[in-house]
C-alpha cells in the first residue's frame, strides 16, 4: 500500500503565440480546481475509463478575476497535494490523466458550475520511494507544470510497496527465512501478505496480494469446491485447480421454476425468484407467510404471520413490487445528456448515445476538429459532432483547398465586368457607372453620386474591391 | 460512496405547505442529474421532479404549478418546495442522484426516505 502524490506548480498560458483568453472575467470570476486520474500499466485508455489506481480531487483555488486588457498570467492555484492512496502494489508503470478544471462563481442555481479547462495525459514509469519527478504537459495554448512521486505506507517498501518491514525481535538477526530490509537493517522483511480474504486452508500466495488454490478448490479466495459434475462430456472438463473453464449444461435450461418464477443461476445451483404467494426452492409450495422471507432485495415483510392473512413487503430504495422484486425506473430522470437514449440495465445504467456524442452519459461532444485542418488560413468550427472550414478569402470547399471563384456570384451591377485578383475582386465599369461594385451612376454633368472620387482615380476606372 | 440524506418531511393540513431538502456527500466529483420520486402504499414508485442531465427541469403532471425544484450547487444539494398540498400527495419522498464519482465512474444513489402525510 501506498500513496502517489501530485504536486501541481503552475497553470497558465504556454509558450508562443496565442495566448488563452483568461478563464476568468470581472463579470463571472472563477476558480480552479484539479483531478487526477490514475491507471496501471501503459495502456492508451479512453478518459472516461474507470481510474483502477485511484483518483483525487484537489480543492478550490482562489479565487480570480480577469483585470481587462492585462494578459492572462499563472492562475491561482489551490494549495495542497493531490494525494491517490492505493491498497495494493504499486504497479511501476501507470498512465495518468489530469484535468484542470473551472469553477464560476456567478449565480449558477440551476446549472453547472463548473467546465473543463484543459486535460493532459501521459504514461510514465516510476518506482516506488523515488524521488519527486517534474513534468510539463501543454493542452492547447495552456501549460501544466507540476511534480509526482509515489511512496509507499509503512510497513511496505520497497519500489512496488511488496516487501514489508517490522521492527526486529532480536536485536542481532532476522528470522528463519526473512532477510534484513535496505536500507532499514534495524528492520526485517515481514512474511508474504496474501489478497484479503484467501482462505487461509485452500488458498496460498508466492506474490503479495495473490491468492492461489490448492487442488479441489476454485475462485478468487479459493473458497469455492470444484464441481465435476457440470464439466461431463460434450463441453468437457478442465484441470481440477482452475475448476470448469466451460460449464456444463446451465442449471436453469428447461426452467425448474414452478407457478411463473423465474430462475438465475448461482454458483453452486440455481435459485428461483417466486411470485406473490408461492415460496420453496422450485416457487412449489403456496401459503406464504414473512417467516418464509417472501421479500427481496431487502425488503421488510409486515404482516403475514399465518398463511390466511396477508403480508406487504417495505421496499428499500430502488425496489418496488409486491416482493420488491422489480426496480424503479430510474431512467425517468434523464440522466443521458445531448438526446442519449437511456437503457436501465438493473446492475447499471447504460446511455446509447446520439450520432457526434459520447462518455458513459453522452457528455463529450466530439471534438471533429481534433486532428482536422483547413488549409489556406481556415479555421475549424465545429458543433453537433459536425465539423465545418470557415475559409480565408478566395478559397472555398469543406477543406478549403479549391480556389474560390469571386466573380462567379456577378457582384458587378450595371454590366460590370469582373475579374478575379489575389486580393478579392475588381470590377471594370461600363461607361457611367462608378464604384467597388459599380453601384454608383455617374451623373451628366460628370459630378458622381458620390461625395468625391479618390485622387487620380477618374469615374470610370476598375474600381479594386478588398 | 455517497450518501443521499433527506430532512423537511412530515405532518401538514390540505393546502399547506412543506420544503424538503436532500444533500449529497461522499465521493462525489459531479452530480449528473438528481431529484425526488416518491411512492405512496400500493403504488409504483414515480418521478416528482428532478435536474435531468442535460440541467433542465422535469415535473410530474399532478405536481406542476405546486411544487417547485431547486438546488444549490456548493451544497451538492437539491431542494423540492411543495405547496397546495393535497391528501393525494401523502407518501415516502425518496432523493436519487446520478453521481459522477471520482474515479469517473457513474452511480446511481436513492436516499432513506422522508414521509409526507397530508390530513385534515
Known amino acids: 500500500a501506498g500513496v502517489f502524490e501530485l504536486q501541481i506548480h503552475s497553470f497558465g498560458p504556454g509558450p508562443g503565440p496565442g495566448a488563452p483568453r483568461s478563464p476568468c472575467s470581472a463579470r463571472l470570476p472563477c476558480r480552479l480546481f484539479f483531478r487526477v486520474c490514475l491507471k496501471p500499466g501503459l495502456s492508451e485508455e479512453a478518459a472516461e475509463s474507470p481510474c483502477a489506481l485511484g483518483a483525487a480531487l484537489s480543492a478550490r483555488g482562489p479565487v480570480y478575476t480577469e483585470q481587462p486588457g492585462a494578459p492572462a498570467p499563472d492562475l491561482p492555484l489551490p494549495d495542497g497535494l493531490l494525494q491517490v492512496p492505493f491498497r495494493d502494489a504499486w504497479p511501476g508503470t501507470f498512465s495518468f490523466i489530469i484535468e484542470t478544471w473551472r469553477e464560476e462563481l456567478g449565480d449558477q442555481i440551476g446549472g453547472p458550475a463548473w467546465s473543463l479547462l484543459a486535460r493532459v495525459a501521459g504514461r510514465r514509469r516510476l518506482a516506488a520511494g523515488g524521488p519527486w519527478a517534474r513534468d510539463i504537459q501543454r493542452a492547447g495554448a495552456w501549460e501544466l507544470r507540476f511534480s509526482y512521486r509515489a511512496r509507499c505506507e509503512p510497513p511496505a517498501v520497497g519500489t512496488a510497496c511488496t516487501r514489508l518491514c517490522r521492527p526486529r525481535s532480536a536485536p542481532s538477526r532476522c528470522g528463519p527465512g526473512l532477510r534484513p530490509c535496505a536500507p532499514l537493517e534495524d528492520e526485517c522483511e515481514a512474511p508474504l501478505v496474501c489478497r484479503a480474504g484467501c482462505s487461509p486452508e485452500h488458498g496460498f500466495c508466492e506474490q503479495p496480494g495473490e491468492c492461489r488454490c490448492l487442488e479441489g478448490w476454485t475462485g478468487p479466495l479459493c473458497t469455492v469446491p470444484v464441481s465435476t459434475s457440470s464439466c461431463l462430456s460434450p463441453r468437457g472438463p478442465s484441470s481440477a485447480t482452475t475448476g470448469c473453464l466451460v460449464p456444463g449444461p446451465g442449471p436453469c435450461d428447461g426452467n425448474p421454476c414452478a407457478n411463473g418464477g423465474s430462475c438465475s443461476e448461482t454458483p453452486r445451483s440455481f435459485e428461483c425468484t417466486c411470485p406473490r404467494g408461492f415460496y420453496g426452492l422450485r416457487c412449489e409450495v403456496s401459503g406464504v407467510t414473512c417467516a418464509d422471507g417472501p421479500c427481496f432485495n431487502g425488503g421488510l415483510c409486515v404482516g403475514g404471520a399465518d398463511p390466511d392473512s396477508a403480508y406487504i413487503c417495505h421496499c428499500p430504495p430502488g425496489f418496488q413490487g409486491s416482493n420488491c422484486e422489480k426496480r424503479v425506473d430510474r431512467c425517468s430522470l434523464q440522466p443521458c445528456r445531448n438526446g442519449g437514449l437511456c437503457l436501465d440495465l438493473g446492475h447499471a445504467l447504460r446511455c446509447r448515445c446520439r450520432a457526434g456524442f459520447a462518455g458513459p452519459r453522452c457528455e463529450h461532444d466530439l471534438d471533429d476538429c481534433a486532428g482536422r485542418a483547413c488549409a489556406n488560413g481556415g479555421t475549424c468550427v465545429e458543433g453537433g459532432g459536425a465539423h465545418r472550414c470557415s475559409c480565408a478569402l478566395g478559397f472555398g470547399g469543406r477543406d478549403c483547398r479549391e480556389r474560390a471563384d469571386p466573380c462567379a456570384a456577378r457582384p458587378c451591377a450595371h454590366g460590370g465586368r469582373c475579374y478575379a485578383h489575389f486580393s478579392g475582386l475588381v470590377c471594370a465599369c461600363a461607361p457611367g457607372y462608378m464604384g467597388a461594385r459599380c453601384e454608383f451612376p455617374v451623373h451628366p454633368d460628370g459630378a458622381s453620386a458620390l461625395p468625391a472620387a479618390p485622387p487620380g482615380l477618374r469615374p470610370g476606372d476598375p474600381q479594386r474591391y478588398l | 460512496e455517497v450518501q443521499l440524506v433527506e430532512s423537511g418531511g412530515g405532518e401538514v393540513q390540505p393546502g399547506g405547505s412543506l420544503r424538503l431538502s436532500c444533500a449529497a456527500s461522499?465521493?462525489?466529483?459531479?452530480?449528473?442529474?438528481m431529484g425526488w420520486y416518491r411512492q405512496a402504499p400500493g403504488k409504483q414508485r414515480e418521478l416528482v421532479a428532478g435536474f435531468t442531465g442535460d440541467g433542465s427541469t422535469k415535473y410530474a403532471e399532478s405536481v406542476k404549478g405546486r411544487f417547485t425544484i431547486s438546488r444549490d450547487n456548493a451544497k451538492n444539494t437539491v431542494y423540492l418546495q411543495m405547496s397546495s398540498l393535497r391528501a393525494e400527495d401523502t407518501a415516502v419522498y425518496y432523493c436519487a442522484a446520478d453521481v459522477q464519482l471520482l474515479n469517473t465512474d457513474y452511480e446511481f444513489y436513492w436516499g432513506q426516505g422522508t414521509l409526507v402525510t397530508v390530513k385534515p
Open positions: 461522499g465521493s462525489i466529483f459531479s452530480i449528473n442529474a
